[in-house]
Amino acid sequence: LVPHLGDREKRDSVCPQGKYIHPQNNSICCTKCHKGTYLYNDCPGPGQDTDCRECESGSFTASENHLRHCLSCSKCRKEMGQVEISSCTVDRDTVCGCRKNQYRHYWSENLFQCFNCSLCLNGTVHLSCQEKQNTVCTCHAGFFLRENECVSCSNCKKSLECTKLCLPQIENVKGTEDSGTT
């Protein structure tokens, strides 16, 4: 089975790599524009230059192309805690990221928010904080993990999952209470 190609891909596949088929004359292959530029005018004929112009400030193309317009530079989302890692150039989009000791939490494929890495207070770092993943903590005895924070077993309710982890402490607390009433 031949994979379905869009019209643009079909037209491009007729020409050698780095060239595209003239939209008005399918016997002419024009040279694509370099990254950082866009197509202003198609080449007038075989072997003649394509008219490519440099992208204006605030726009870019990151690969060779025959786009009629450059792409708009992305803006980092300050309200999501994002910071600019590198600014937009004519051939590269803005790179957004998080500050030191923060990680990215993706709400969707194209939207991330920066959160502080957990410090593992009352525990130890099992896995260090990564670009896209929070620190993984292991808690000290007498503490259990809740939302990646080590919480005292004194906050463990019997109905919760923490009862398994806090079982010795819960029994000790119960024993102390019993001995206090005799």
Partner: nanobody
Framework: EVQLLESGGGLVQPGGSLRLSCAAS????????MAWVRQAPGKGLEWVST????????YYADSVKGRFTISRDNSKNTLYLQMNSLRAEDTAVYYC????????????WGQGTLVTVSS
């Protein structure tokens, strides 16, 4: 005490529309980013949309982009979700929540309103 009260859910046919509202109290509403999240039957909580505190920035899950619109009226302490072109897979309990600031977890959310999309 933070209180969030959703309304506007109901039964709607595929392709139909609904507008959800969320009345907020117990905190300074205009200072907080707000979100809509949903929980389909037998599924986990899914983030749907977020709006910044002033309303100038809006974000959507890919599954609802182009169909749902989040908005807010800070003078009325109310959050809205306009849902168009509804699909069966949009069936869920919809909750409004304060958008998280310190960790990726919704600390404060309402009791929810059920949206059922069925013919």
């Amino acid at each position: 005490e933070v209180q969030l009260l959703e309304s506007g859910g109901g039964l709607v046919q595929p392709g139909g529309s609904l507008r959800l509202s969320c009345a907020a109290s117990g905190f300074t509403f205009p200072e907080y980013g707000m979100a809509w999240v949903r929980q389909a039957p037998g599924k986990g909580l899914e983030w749907v949309s977020t709006i910044s505190h002033g309303g100038e920035h809006t974000y959507y899950a890919d599954s609802v982009k182009g169909r749902f619109t989040i908005s807010r009226d800070n003078s009325k302490n109310t959050l809205y979700l306009q849902m168009n072109s509804l699909r069966a897979e949009d069936t869920a309990v919809y909750y409004c929540a304060q958008h998280p600031v310190s960790h990726p977890k919704f600390d404060y959310w309402g009791q929810g309103t059920l949206v059922t999309v069925s013919s």
